[in-house]
Amino acid sequence: VPRWRQQWSGPGTTKRFPETVLARCVKYTEIHPEMRHVDCQSVWDAFKGAFISKHPCNITEEDYQPLMKLGTQTVPCNKILLWSRIKDLAHQFTQVQRDMFTLEDTLLGYLADDLTWCGEFNTSKINYQSCPDWRKDCSNNPVSVFWKTVSRRFAEAACDVVHVMLNGSRSKIFDKNSTFGSVEVHNLQPEKVQTLEAWVIHGGREDSRDLCQDPTIKELESIISKRNIQFSCKNIYRPDKFLQCVKNPEDSSCTSEI
């Protein structure tokens, strides 16, 4: 008789999750010489250890510490690009602008990007049927805690001018409840970070509004200023220029070196 299994509201673990994480790790360490020392089997073991046999609503940042330690990576702290609700374009930008980095350009972010995972209390099984939804079930689930942990560390590492790409097509351009709004903003270090520069990406070709005057941007400015970090906002038009570069990343147009 099959054992009763908890039904969660969210999708289950991504199929072939262990193989995917291991393969991504191998690929990443091959491409990035500074991470060649990483033992991907150990990385997988640490990843697995963070959530296997644990109740998927009782995961803590502490559970991920062994993985964080193995995935320790130094990126240029003044070349960090944060993003909110505009992941694809941010990634297209850093594919092209190779000297800037999103969280998903780091090993740990790359391993987990777009994946879902969870286990079950007291069994070594991975749950491929369902995993907790952040809103409907619980916030301390394996995926949410992972991203909260790595996002906090990424923000803490930032220095000088930090850029954040925001989606000007959304009703809330800055959302306090996003990972950027709830974690990264509050973990930028005022003694290291001089300025947060927001890039508000416009969608429409005829759009000539000043979205830097949006109330949610004013809210972001207020939060940042109270943390003694300078704030700057720029309207960015013609995002099709980014897309062209993704198709032809070697092209000379796809670099800010003028």
């Epitope: 000043d210 906002c233 720029k234 038009y237 099709d240 220029k241 032809n248 003028i258």
Partner: antibody, heavy 120, light 107 residues
């Protein structure tokens, strides 16, 4: 190195037409927005028109909208400006200019310009 | 549409610092570009993205942008810097605008 060479300027009567060309070399033409900027004698710079990489999006200054048409032929690395219903105030040196990449919208390179004189 | 206002002329002694201003409503919300134009020549980009220098432009050229004003600063101005300078910004759609230009005279 990047080169932009304009041609097609000259003397034309008010109400007449002219077609300017800009031959581009030294870069991947189809990867950039391209622009026309003009400068009346003794005056400042005025942006005229822009066209996206594949020509599917065009922009015009109010002063030329409905009279000028920008186009490009990526197979020939050439930018065009068809100017109809020309007026005396269109008299200027017309520059072809290549856009900056990514988040920037300015002009990295300029041609030497071609003079358009509208006079009877 | 944003309007960019520049002083018609600025004078500076050789070796001194020249500052050319460019003002417009909430200009800080847009990237600003600066061009140098010498008589009979095409403009040349000297600053892009508020403060970045293209390769080949001397270090004495710098830019800033805050509040409603962008500034082009030329430190240790040389005779060869005498030219017209134009600021430019883009505010979306068909709103690409230049300032009226500033004639820099090196005394």
């Amino acid at each position: 190195q990047v080169q932009l060479v304009e041609s097609g300027g000259g003397l034309v009567q008010p109400g007449g037409s002219l077609r300017l060309s800009c031959a581009a070399s030294g870069f991947t033409f189809s990867s950039y927005y391209m622009n026309w900027v003009r400068q009346a004698p003794g005056k400042g710079l005025e942006w005229v028109s822009a066209i996206s990489m594949h020509g599917d999006t065009t922009y015009y200054a109010d002063s030329v909208k409905g009279r000028f048409t920008i186009s490009r032929d990526n197979s020939k690395n050439t930018l065009y400006l068809q100017m109809n219903s020309l007026r005396a105030e269109d008299t200027a040196v017309y520059y072809c200019a290549r856009d900056l990449p990514l988040v920037y919208t300015g002009f990295a390179y300029w041609g030497q310009g071609t003079l358009v004189t509208v006079s009877s | 549409d944003i309007e960019l206002t520049q002083p018609p002329s600025v004078s500076v002694a050789p070796g001194q610092t020249a500052r050319i201003s460019c003002s417009g409503d909430n200009l800080r919300h847009y990237y600003v570009y600066w061009y140098q134009q010498k008589p009979g020549q095409a403009p040349v980009l000297v600053i892009y993205g508020d403060s970045k220098r293209p390769s080949g432009i001397p270090e004495r050229f710098s830019g800033s942008n805050s509040g409603n004003t962008a500034t082009l600063t030329i430190s240790g101005t040389q005779a060869e810097d005498e030219a017209d300078y134009y600021c430019q910004t883009y505010t979306g759609g068909a709103s690409l605008v230049f300032g009226g230009g500033t004639k820099l005279t090196v005394l």
